[in-house]
Interface confidence: low
């Protein structure tokens, strides 16, 4: 079976700065290299707007939903039909192919499955899904995601959003 892990599921980065979304995988069948696919999905709700209006009715509703289902993430969990979905890049063997929307961007898949942006853009905020597929190994948890927020350096906005950590907090 395939097991895909995104060790750091939260990223906040300043506009035009680089970022790497790490993804690792383990396979029970290692005869052939799998295909790595990174997909972009827009946030189901506006992450940035919610961060600046934490007392809004919608946010209170989200908090109630999360209390009933601790695993619920209102920014990630919604149907693809109500958000933008794009293939960012795929890697097969040593060949990396960018999706149509990302042609010309300095984006690549480094290492086995890490997605690297040399320079982030405004529209890059969203949820990035790392999928690993093998024709010989169809079972297991073959997908994991990371959230990315791109912030501008403006006087009105803090560089790191309240309640949104830039990396995993260790106990």
């Amino acid at each position: 079976a395939i097991q895909v892990t995104v060790p750091d599921p939260y990223h906040v980065v300043i506009l035009f700065q680089p970022v790497t979304l790490h993804c690792t995988y383990q396979m029970s069948n290692t005869l052939t290299a799998p295909i790595v696919i990174w997909k972009y999905k827009s946030f189901c709700r506006d992450r940035v707007a919610d961060a600046f209006s934490p007392a809004s009715v919608d946010n209170q509703l989200n908090a109630q939903l999360a209390a009933g289902n601790p695993g619920y993430n209102p920014y990630v969990e919604c149907q693809d039909s109500v958000r933008t979905v794009r293939v960012v890049a795929t890697k097969q063997g040593n060949a990396v192919t960018l999706g149509d929307y990302y042609q010309g961007r300095r984006i690549t898949i480094t290492g086995n499955a890490d997605l690297t942006f040399e320079q982030t853009a405004w529209g890059d905020s969203g949820v990035y899904y790392c999928s690993v597929v093998s024709a010989q190994d169809l079972d297991g948890n073959n997908e994991a995601y990371a959230e990315l927020i791109v912030l501008g350096r403006t006087s009105e906005a803090p560089e790191l959003l309240p309640g949104f950590r830039a990396g995993p907090l260790e106990d």
């Epitope: 079976a1 029970s28 069948n29 795929t90 024709a135 190994d137 079972d139």
Partner: antibody, heavy 115, light 106 residues
Framework: AVTLDESGGGLQTPGGALSLVCEAS????????MQWVRQAPGKGLEWVAG????????RYGSAVQGRATISRDNGQSTVRLQLNNLRAEDTGTYYC????????WGHGTEVIVST | ALTQPASVSANPGETVKITCSGG????????YSWHQQKSPGSAPVTVI????QRPSDIPSRFSGSKSGSTATLTITGVQAEDEAVYFC?????????FGAGTTLTV
């Protein structure tokens, strides 16, 4: 070496049921999707059914949809095909095969559906 | 169904190419396998899987390649014992697929 041994074929009556078993050895069975493929006399290969490594996903060819059940026992390294409501057109040699994109075949077991 | 030529012929020592198209797209990539059957009712033998992977017991004169959605089986320096029917295989999201077979006459 990878070996796949099918059994359970033979003369069957229309409307009846058959159960084919494939015994696998020589590889990590639970890591591989398994397939059943058949070949009618003088015809080409026809995909029948497939099952994922852990057995959580199955799929069937249109000719047997609703009549076939594929299952596997990873402890025994076996995969089974149950085919009900047999028809004359189910006659042929049934092969067990390994992988989504098949990389190993069994020797086959012949099934004849006739009165 | 997959599309492949009904027959090809070659003299010993020549190079033979058999094409196959119509396979399913698996996350944007097309995958094919090639299977040799020397006589009707005898078990097929896989000569190429995952487009270009050759099982360890298959001679190196067999190779596979893929361009776009079309796969090609190449036999370099064909030999008399290569005379057989060659089936290409693939799959889509719901089913396995096979071509009707190409008869190679040497």
């Amino acid at each position: 070496a990878v070996t796949l041994d099918e059994s359970g074929g033979g003369l069957q009556t229309p409307g009846g049921a058959l159960s084919l078993v494939c015994e696998a050895s020589g590889f990590d069975f639970s890591s591989h999707e398994m397939q059943w493929v058949r070949q009618a006399p003088g015809k080409g290969l026809e995909w029948v059914a497939g099952i994922s490594g852990a057995g959580s996903s199955t799929r069937y060819g249109s000719a047997v949809q609703g009549r076939a059940t594929i299952s596997r026992d990873n402890g025994q390294s076996t995969v089974r095909l149950q085919l009900n409501n047999l028809r004359a057109e189910d006659t042929g040699t049934y092969y067990c095969a390994r992988g989504s994109l098949i990389d190993a075949w069994g020797h086959g077991t012949e099934v004849i559906v006739s009165t | 169904a997959l599309t492949q030529p009904a027959s090809v012929s070659a003299n010993p020592g020549e190079t033979v190419k058999i094409t196959c198209s119509g396979g399913g797209s698996y996350y944007g990539s097309y995958y094919y396998s090639w299977h040799q059957q020397k006589s009707p009712g005898s078990a097929p033998v896989t000569v190429i899987y995952e487009n270009n992977q050759r099982p360890s017991d298959i001679p190196s004169r067999f190779s596979g390649s893929k361009s776009g959605s079309t796969a090609t089986l190449t036999i370099t320096g064909v030999q008399a014992e290569d005379e057989a029917v060659y089936f290409c295989g693939s799959y889509d999201s719901s089913a396995g697929l096979f071509g009707a077979g190409t008869t190679l006459t040497v």
